[in-house]
Amino acid sequence: MKVLQEPTCVSDYMSISTCEWKMNGPTNCSTELRLLYQLVFLLSEAHTCIPENNGGAGCVCHLLMDDVVSADNYTLDLWAGQQLLWKGSFKPSEHVKPRAPGNLTVHTNVSDTLLLTWSNPYPPDNYLYNHLTYAVNIWSENDPADFRIYNVTYLEPSLRIAASTLKSGISYRARVRAWAQCYNTTWSEWSPSTKWHNSYREPFEQH
């Protein structure tokens, strides 16, 4: 049994880091493998993550963490029984993938303005809470070419757009994702999408 693709890990900078790797053949990850992880810190203990299958030869492990600070570094040991398959380390602050925003809501009752709001996925005491910026994706269900991205570079989890910038009388969907420049993170996953029917009053033409 050998590791074909070494584990790569990302942290949500809160409570979970996710490590993925590939074996050289079909593997029952949960019964055959264990990923041991230990914070490099005085008197810390090793903890065990039981991996799950992620495709035939792929494995994924969700490492529970109490919290994360920038100085943290973990040792990782991948075991198959008594055999050490791979040894590495992981610094969560250098491999951050933020949590996806939630509760995306489209408010259509504000005159001819669409107000999109969502929730910051972090609690106020987490460092990322005040460092997230967002991308909002809006697309038409009827027209695949009608697809747009709005970059929200301010901290407030909301976006206002004129309803007239979208076509009237058709359905649109929106989703949002987050990233944090301070840790040069990757983008989060997209939030679940939300749907609304776009309708607004056309202004009377002046002759």
Epitope: L39, L42, L43, E45, H47, M65, S70
Partner: antibody
């Protein structure tokens, strides 16, 4: 009441051995790292050794490395310090102390918040 | 090893007056925001040491509020706002960030 009680001290000749014990009560012993600190007559405090809650990780001062062994029996709520190849400079009062919560992913530290009464070790010919 | 240097080594104080002890470490003891791994202990004559302050500024359970700890990185201070007769003894700072734990030399506080 949270309590630590040391025993096992005494007079021993240079080159001899002693085993100190520290019995814990009033707290969940296995969840805490434990530490030994000593104090030579008229001197300050000197850290000797520490052990994690599971016993899987141990640390020693250079002055005792290779001669002293720290261990624990969580079923008996007891910490030990096996002292071999004793030297005159090991003469001191030995204290055990309750250290950080070490079973969490990140050890939780609240200082060495409980100390035993101390046991005296005298090494002399 | 991290060296902990205390000053003064002797501190005569009049009851009711404030007192201050300094401790300097040879390396930073700051691990993360607000977490400095330095403690303060008091050892009264013939007794075991007792914890006063942990993580630089957290008062241990049962410690009177006249004791306070401050500082970050390499420079730390223990302050007693109004010294009482029962405060006499040796005060030690200790770092617990890395092995080996190291103590300061001790400061002897005595009543004038």
């Amino acid at each position: 009441e949270v309590q630590l009680v040391e025993s096992g001290g005494g007079l021993e000749q240079p080159g001899g051995s002693l085993r100190l014990s520290c019995a814990g009560s009033g707290f969940t012993f296995r969840t805490y790292a434990m530490t030994w600190v000593r104090q030579a007559p008229g001197k300050g405090l000197e850290w000797v050794s520490s052990i994690s809650g599971s016993g899987g990780n141990t640390y020693y001062a250079d002055s005792v490395k290779g001669r002293f062994t720290i261990s624990r029996d969580n079923s008996k709520n007891t910490l030990y310090l096996q002292m071999n190849s004793l030297r005159a400079e090991d003469t001191a009062v030995y204290y055990c102390a309750k250290d950080r919560v070490s079973i969490t992913i990140r050890p939780r530290y609240y200082g060495l918040d409980v100390w035993g009464q101390g046991t005296t070790v005298t090494v002399s010919s | 090893d991290i060296v902990m240097t205390q000053s003064p080594l002797s501190l005569p104080v009049t009851p009711g007056e404030p007192a201050s002890i300094s401790c300097t470490s040879s390396q930073s003891l700051l691990y993360s925001i607000g977490k400095n791994y330095v403690d303060w202990y008091l050892q009264k004559s013939g007794q075991s040491p007792q914890l006063l302050i942990y993580e630089g500024n957290n008062r241990a359970t049962g410690v009177p509020d006249r004791f306070s700890g401050s500082g970050s990185g390499t420079d730390f201070t223990l302050k007693i706002s109004r010294v009482e007769a029962e405060d006499v003894g040796f005060y030690y700072c200790m770092q617990s960030l890395t092995s080996p734990y190291t103590f300061g030399q001790g400061t002897k506080l005595e009543i004038k």
